[in-house]
Amino acid sequence: RLSWYDPDFQARLTRSNSKCQGQLEVYLKDGWHMVCSQSWGRSSKQWEDPSQASKVCQRLNCGVPLSLGPFLVTYTPQSSIICYGQLGSFSNCSHSRNDMCHSLGLTCLEPQKTTPPTTRPPPTTTPEPTAPPRLQLVAQSGGQHCAGVVEFYSGSLGGTISYEAQDKTQDLENFLCNNLQCGSFLKHLPETEAGRAQDPGEPREHQPLPIQWKIQNSSCTSLEHCFRKIKPQKSGRVLALLCSGFQPKVQSRLVGGSSICEGTVEVRQGAQWAALCDSSSARSSLRWEEVCREQQCGSVNSYRVLDAGDPTSRGLFCPHQKLSQCHELWERNSYCKKVFVTCQDPNP
């Protein structure tokens, strides 16, 4: 049966800065086709259990699937198909009119160069360990990859890291993000965001670990010299990080222009698209270069801020210079100044 389980089946994810997330395209017969999210009897707004696409993520050398559902509604110059039958089957597909097709999006974890432990080592009081020390980032349930509370394991001893806001630890955070294969340090996360709020019914393996660590050397260059063991503390902050490799990234699109390469910038928060509001932190063209790249267009030709005379104009706001640094978008409920961007069109 012709499906994404076929060992020779080829797929790719496009319209994003990462090979592990984007719009699903499949190779079928004589070329690449965008898969419509209405395929297999689904509605264009329906989100699927992402584990059904694990074979696709695996083939792309990415990690486990995080989400499978509608990607973005935009003009798509390439061929698009709607498929029928079982999810993931391509035996019965028909060409779709591009304006009827809402493309299917898939987000897989970025690949990790080394595999972190999938389960936490059991809490124990065995003698001091000899196994190499390692780190783990524990995200909120359904949370992001490369964002969460840092746990340090030295052999079978593991726990969180006590952290004081006044600690000058920028070098350490960069070292930790790097060690986790997550890029560089972006910011500290409040514990609620990082997922520390403990659910009383949470399974045993997610209960707080019995060991706690304190930063011993913030300029350390190997893990064994960074932390020392302390008595677990009832109160106080624990180290929670957001690294540049976090996923899924904010997705963008250009709407209302004469081609896919120009229009007002919109971004997606969850399943919702909204206008991206102008931000004083993004006055250079760097942000728009990134947006143009995500649309698979050339570099920025121009960008202009549209007048926000309307106090009811709403949208989303990213406080960073680049969207790829935005771990969360903030809602702006009034005076949202939209931005119209024109990128070079590779296929004029």
């Epitope: 049966r1 012709l2 076929d6 020779d8 089946f9 080829q10 790719r12 190779y27 079928l28 017969k29 004589d30 070329g31 690449w32 391509f90 035996s91 019965n92």
Partner: antibody
Framework: QVTLKESGPGILKPSQTLSLTCSFS??????????VGWIRQPSGKGLEWLAH???????YYNPSLKNQLTISKDASRDQVFLKITNLDTADTATYYC????????????WGQGTTLTVSS | NIVMTQSHKFMSTSVGDRVSIACKAS??????VAWYQQKPGQSPKLLIY???TRHTGVPDRFTGSGSGTDFTLTITNVQSEDLADYFC????????FGSGTRLELK
């Protein structure tokens, strides 16, 4: 095992129509993902893809020859046919029948070829 | 139409050598490239598809590499039975072939 065998007239005159038949075994054109097509090769020259037909009756033609070509199949008899109209001496070549899967695994099986000479 | 250019019509080699046959696409074809071997009086045989995947039964001395517009078929430890014509083929958009490279003995 997979085999494909071409048959054709051998010699035709310019402006005539060529009819080729490919008879195959070892797979079925009713199986999803299967396709059969035609490629030609003038003596001592390169390969030129002509047309392809798929399990679901979808057909693809070489855009530069599209108006001259018609491909069809009889899946129950394991046969594929190609018609080329308005022949020219430049159509003199060996014509190969090939199998291909929809997942893009190349032309994985080829027939032995049938030679056509177009001459007045 | 995408044009596939094999700049070397002929390449000379010796048994035991390593030889690389190049193929250039006129536009980006991703990794949708296959390689075929054709001996005199025979039909072409598929060697490699999706740039680097060997077809069933193809010896591991044949390897493919590249992406975008530049592709290479490498034969390590050339055997006398490898002397033949080699064609590249792109199938990213329809199907087009290179004009072929003949591998011959020095």
């Amino acid at each position: 095992q997979v085999t494909l065998k071409e048959s054709g007239p051998g010699i035709l005159k310019p402006s005539q129509t060529l009819s080729l038949t490919c008879s195959f075994s070892g797979f079925s054109l009713s199986t999803s993902g299967m396709g059969v097509g035609w490629i030609r090769q003038p003596s001592g020259k390169g390969l030129e893809w002509l047309a392809h037909i798929w399990w679901d009756d979808d057909v693809y033609y070489n855009p530069s020859l599209k108006n001259q070509l018609t491909i069809s199949k009889d899946a129950s008899r394991d046969q594929v046919f190609l018609k080329i109209t308005n022949l020219d001496t430049a159509d003199t070549a060996t014509y190969y029948c090939v199998r291909r899967r929809a997942t893009g695994t190349g032309f994985d099986y080829w027939g032995q070829g049938t030679t056509l000479t177009v001459s007045s | 139409n995408i044009v596939m250019t094999q700049s070397h019509k002929f390449m000379s080699t010796s048994v035991g050598d390593r030889v690389s046959i190049a193929c250039k696409a006129s536009q980006d074809v991703g990794t949708a490239v296959a390689w075929y071997q054709q001996k005199p009086g025979q039909s072409p045989k598929l060697l490699i598809y999706w740039t680097s995947t060997r077809h069933t039964g193809v010896p591991d001395r044949f390897t493919g590499s590249g992406s975008g517009t530049d592709f290479t078929l490498t034969i390590t430890n050339v055997q006398s039975e490898d002397l033949a014509d080699y064609f590249c083929h792109q199938y990213n958009s329809y199907n087009t072939f290179g004009s072929g490279t003949r591998l011959e003995l020095k």
